[in-house]
């Protein structure tokens, strides 16, 4: 970067080199240059020349003020105007940087997904800081008191193999820059209860032309977990609005779930799934798009027919089907 | 050789706008500093507004006398600098320079146009 | 802004006379110190730059000198054409600032 030119004098900042954003800085700039009393001293910031707010301090020093400065970072450098010299001649040059201390880490959340081997830590981090922040995640076994520490610049996954301090650890994050450092509140956890099953899929969907067309989606999951409890959602992809189903689910064979639909409409589904009774959900599984079919069966009542295709209601027969869809992306 | 010729001066009521324009030629327009320096009846030079070269990316500053009613702009593919004048005042009443800066002072001068600001 | 005061804010000399003009700045500008002769119903023209450069095809009776903050113009040999109002700039700092010129009339 800048840092690395051959210097003929120096350029420090005050307060800082890494400050807050915001605050009101000074650039110095002191030239030593042989047979040069420069008659000017000039500021270039990212290549372009600073006009204003430059003080002469001395023969040799010069100030650049620069009021709530705001930008992450800045490659400044400093130039003297030597008589005899047509150009300018280079003093040196130093990369700059603004932003902010680190807030409270909180929202500390760890899991374990089926078949990983790590346990996964994430946090909310706050605020931007816009400068280099570090996280150090610290696991306390609750049952050796034996506590390691992870560094890292976001997330962490830990192997459950360095695990070996028991089932019940105490878990928080500290965050450290530049400009101040924090630490989270202390997360207990139980191994057995953080285990998020592994993803469910929704493979395909097929809509079946009967008198109420019904639309078969099929979706499973390689869990080894017996107990899961999985959540469907559907609706339109022109409506602002979710409808959810709950399901109690064994997958020791790939489950049909039926739904009374909409004809000639393009729907989106997606599936998620947790060990039954416990805290965390997977994360919802990729869009799946259907479109059902144009074909509208004669019925007598509108009533009855526009309550059948908004119910959406689950059905527990299960039939081969004649319309069938396999799109993950739309 | 350089030259600089400004246009758009006259007599004008108070509050009312007037622009005036610098036609440049004889040097490379765009990395060079242009001006505007006014010289009222009988009075000294001051300098109104500024308009820097490429290599300040074009900073701009003006005279607090002038601040939010005049704008100077500069168009490098027509080697012309602009001064527009809004709400003009008596005070405002001068022989108005285009002048031409490399480094700060000012190495050419424009002969000058008329502004008289008058009911 | 960097303040110039010019003295005197008028003359009067003969041709022939040695004349002097000065400057004071209200801090040290570094020699950068320019001097412009204007002349009635004319533009400023630039005589002397870097306190003590002289523009091309200005005659050399036009010298300048000084450092720090006071500055001083020397006409060695009062011409005719010589007679004229002398403003100093300062570029030290922006923004460039004038003195407030020195009329020099005919005795």
């Known amino acids: 970067g800048i840092t690395n030119i051959n210097c003929s004098g120096h350029i420090w900042v005050e307060p800082a080199t890494i400050f807050k954003m915001g605050m009101n800085i000074s650039i110095y700039c002191q030239a030593a240059i042989k047979n040069c009393q420069p008659r000017k001293l000039h500021f270039y910031k990212n290549g372009i020349k600073e006009r204003f707010q430059i003080t002469r301090i001395n023969k040799t020093t010069a100030r650049l003020w620069y009021k709530n400065f705001l930008e992450p970072h800045a490659s400044m450098y400093c130039t003297a105007e030597c008589p005899k010299h047509f150009q300018e001649t280079l003093i040196c040059g130093k990369d700059i940087s603004s932003g902010y201390p680190p807030d409270i880490p909180d929202e500390v959340t760890c899991v374990i997904y089926e078949y990983s081997g790590n346990m996964t830590c994430t946090w909310n981090a706050g605020k931007l800081t816009y400068i280099d922040t570090k996280y150090v995640v610290h696991v306390k076994s609750l049952e050796t008191e034996e506590e390691q520490q992870y560094l890292t610049s976001s997330y962490i996954n830990i192997s459950t193999d360095s695990l070996q301090g028991g089932k019940k650890y105490l878990v928080w994050v500290q965050a450290a820059n530049a400009l101040g450092m924090e630490e989270s509140k202390q997360l207990q956890i139980h191994l057995d209860d953080i285990v998020i099953p592994s993803a469910a899929v929704i493979s395909r969907a097929e809509t079946i032309n009967a008198t109420v067309p019904k639309t078969i989606i099929y979706w499973d999951s390689q869990t080894t977990i017996e107990k899961v409890s999985c959540e469907m959602r559907y609706k339109a992809t022109t409506n602002q609005t979710w409808n959810v189903k709950e399901f109690d689910t064994n997958f020791t064979y790939v489950q049909q779930s039926e739904f009374y639909l909409e004809p000639n409409i393009k729907y989106v589904f997606q599936v998620r799934c947790q060990e039954t009774g416990k805290r965390y959900w997977q994360p919802w599984s990729s869009p799946f798009f259907h479109k059902t079919p144009e074909t509208v069966p004669q019925v007598t009542s509108k009533a009855f027919q526009h309550d059948t295709w908004n119910s959406g209601l689950t059905v527990a027969s299960i039939s081969t089907g004649h319309l069938t869809s396999d799109n993950r992306g739309d | 050789q350089v030259q600089l010729v400004e246009s758009g001066g006259g007599v004008v009521q108070p509050g009312r706008s007037l622009r005036l324009s610098c036609a440049a030629s004889g040097f490379d327009f765009s990395s060079y500093g242009m001006s505007w320096v006014r010289q009222a009846p009988g009075k000294g030079l001051d300098l109104v507004a500024d308009i820097n070269s490429k290599s300040y990316n074009y900073a701009t500053y003006y005279a607090d006398s002038v601040k939010d009613r005049f704008t100077i702009s500069r168009d490098n593919s027509k080697n012309t600098l602009y001064l527009q004048m809004n709400s003009l005042r008596a005070e405002d009443t001068a022989v108005y320079y285009c002048a031409v800066h490399h480094s700060d002072y000012f190495e050419y001068w424009g002969q000058g146009t008329l502004v008289t600001v008058s009911s | 802004d960097i303040q110039m005061t010019q003295s005197p804010s008028s003359l009067s000399a003969s041709v022939g006379d040695r004349v002097t003009i000065t400057c004071r700045a209200s801090q040290d500008i570094y020699t950068n110190l320019a001097w412009y002769q204007q002349k009635p119903g004319k533009a400023p023209k630039l005589l002397i730059y870097?306190?003590?450069s002289l523009q091309d095809g200005v005659p050399s009776r036009f010298s300048g000198s000084g450092s720090g903050t006071d500055y001083t113009l020397t006409i060695s040999s009062l011409q005719p054409e010589d007679f004229a109002t002398y403003y100093c700039?300062?570029?030290?700092?922006?923004?460039?600032?004038f003195g407030q010129g020195t009329k020099v009339e005919i005795k």
């Open positions: 700039l300062q570029d030290s700092e922006y923004p460039p600032t």
């Open positions: 870097h306190a003590s």
